[in-house]
């Protein structure tokens, strides 16, 4: 396979209908969730938002790839969204769900 | 390949000599850095410390595995360590380095 691109945020729109949640979620119909993907390879440059541990792990992986994996590309900033939905008693509830939208990614 | 085990913390001792840092780091000689590895597969149970986004991404991955990856196994809790080292002017410095030790892992 080709070399993967560096760890970064990718756009992803999630439709609640596609997830089969349309019967209990009233609004929105979906949202821009996004996701993180890409390589966390040496050298980890500034835009990869790498932790100190990720930098150490990258060096150990290069030395010892059979036992220690590369760090992985994961969200570093997440936002909430508000959802209007029916609860179990068919009441309409407005609730803020934390950590639903990826705003930024990094190597962890 | 076989099913990988679920996302969890793995023990890893890092020797500063192996990293080639022995000439500038005085103490410690190394430290228990640990690392995260394993699958973030459906269903994401409680001990996987999954974010709401990771739960959504897992469902989207099941629907569309070619385009959206599984969430990745990454540190959820990191600790600092204190390091005694020589700076560029050969002064001995004691500094606390953040995010050096993995304490817990989760699906992100």
């Amino acid at each position: 396979s080709e070399l993967k691109t560096a760890c970064k945020k990718h756009e992803l729109y999630v439709s609640f209908q596609d997830l089969g949640w349309q019967d209990w979620i009233i609004a929105p119909k979906g949202y821009a969730a996004n996701y993180c993907d890409g390589e966390c390879s040496f050298p980890l440059n500034a835009h990869m938002n790498a932790t100190n541990h990720a930098i150490v792990q990258t060096l150990v992986h290069l030395m010892n790839p059979e036992y220690v994996p590369k760090p992985c590309c994961a969200p570093t900033k997440l936002n909430a969204i508000s959802v209007l939905y029916f609860d179990d008693n068919s009441n309409v509830i407005l609730k803020k769900y934390r950590n639903m939208v990826v705003r930024a990614c990094g190597c962890h | 390949s076989e099913l990988k085990t679920a996302c969890k913390k793995h023990e890893l001792y890092v020797s500063f000599q192996d990293l080639g840092w022995q000439d500038w780091i005085i103490a410690p000689k190394g430290y228990a850095a640990n690392y995260c590895d394993g699958e973030c597969s459906f269903p994401l149970n409680a001990h996987m410390n999954a974010t709401n986004h990771a739960i959504v991404q897992t469902l989207v991955h099941l629907m569309n595995p070619e385009y959206v990856p599984k969430p990745c196994c990454a540190p959820t809790k990191l600790n600092a360590i204190s390091v005694l080292y020589f700076d560029d002017n050969s002064n001995v410095i004691l500094k606390k380095y953040r995010n050096m030790v993995v304490r817990a892992c989760g699906c992100h």
């Epitope: 396979s1 080709e2 070399l3 390589e39 390879s41 040496f42 050298p43 290069l62 030395m63 010892n64 790839p65 059979e66 036992y67 | 390949s1 076989e2 099913l3 990988k4 085990t5 793995h10 192996d18 590895d37 394993g38 699958e39």
Partner: antibody
Framework: QVQLVESGGGLVKPGGSLRLSCAAS????????VHWVRQAPGKGLEWVGR??????????EYAASVKGRFTISRDDSKNTLYLQMNSLKTEDTAVYYC????????????WGQGTLVTVSS | QSVLTQPPSVSGAPGQRVTISCTGS?????????VHWYQQLPGTAPKLLIY???ERPSGVPDRFSGSKSGTSASLAITGLQAEDEADYYC???????????FGGGTKLTVLG
């Protein structure tokens, strides 16, 4: 001392199957990643595949040339590595070595003596 | 064709110094992965000679040394001896295709 001993090689017809074993002794087998490497007569070394540890779910990876035909497994209770070879081709003729990966720098620090697999009609 | 490129053969007289090169790419040696070297005497299994670029396992004479720069690595043998006549292979790890990659091997001939 560390020892790896392969067995199970022999003559097999194209399309046939063979199962190789690698018996390990003198070390804690379950703590080491192990690989199969082969060498066709008069040729260089070719990586076949590897199997990781229990903590990594015994994940196995393969070279493109054998993927889908060969399966690597291990039995830590028996200190044994296996290579199941199906749909064998004449180009699979080689000496097959098992090799242990040392734990700090990932080099193959111990090799078996090899077992010859000949695929011919 | 091997992912890592080595010269098919090198030769030298006893006592001389020879080097064997191993050229890779940005997805293996150039990506920072360790390089290991193996010696294979005729009719025997390979033996680890150098690991992690430049470290020698116990029992390997200090006449053997390894180095790495950019996308290449090299093995140097000083004070060449008749018993050094063997095939030498470099090996690394590759993030773009197969995991483990080998060089095609270099046959070292000790002259005279």
């Amino acid at each position: 001392q560390v020892q790896l001993v392969e067995s199970g090689g022999g003559l097999v017809k194209p399309g046939g199957s063979l199962r190789l074993s690698c018996a390990a002794s003198g070390f804690t087998f379950s703590s080491y990643v192990v690989h199969w490497v082969r060498q066709a007569p008069g040729k260089g070394l070719e990586w076949v595949g590897r199997i990781r540890l229990e903590t990594h779910g015994y994940a196995a990876e393969y070279a493109a040339s054998v993927k889908g035909r060969f399966t690597i497994s291990r039995d830590d209770s028996k200190n044994t590595l296996y290579l199941q070879m199906n749909s064998l081709k004449t180009e699979d003729t080689a000496v097959y070595y098992c090799a242990r990966v040392e734990r700090s720098k990932s080099g193959f620090d111990n090799w078996g003596q090899g077992t010859l697999v000949t695929v011919s009609s | 064709q091997s992912v890592l490129t080595q010269p098919p053969s090198v030769s030298g007289a006893p006592g001389q110094r020879v080097t064997i090169s191993c050229t890779g790419s940005s997805s293996n040696i150039g990506a920072g992965y360790s390089v290991h070297w193996y010696q294979q005497l005729p009719g025997t299994a390979p033996k680890l000679l150098i690991y992690g670029q430049s470290e020698r396992p116990s029992g390997v004479p200090d006449r053997f040394s390894g180095s790495k720069s950019g996308t290449s690595a090299s093995l140097a043998i000083t004070g060449l001896q008749a018993e050094d006549e063997a095939d030498y292979y470099c090996q690394s790890w590759d993030s773009s295709q197969t995991l483990v990659v080998f060089g095609g091997g270099t046959k070292l001939t000790v002259l005279g």
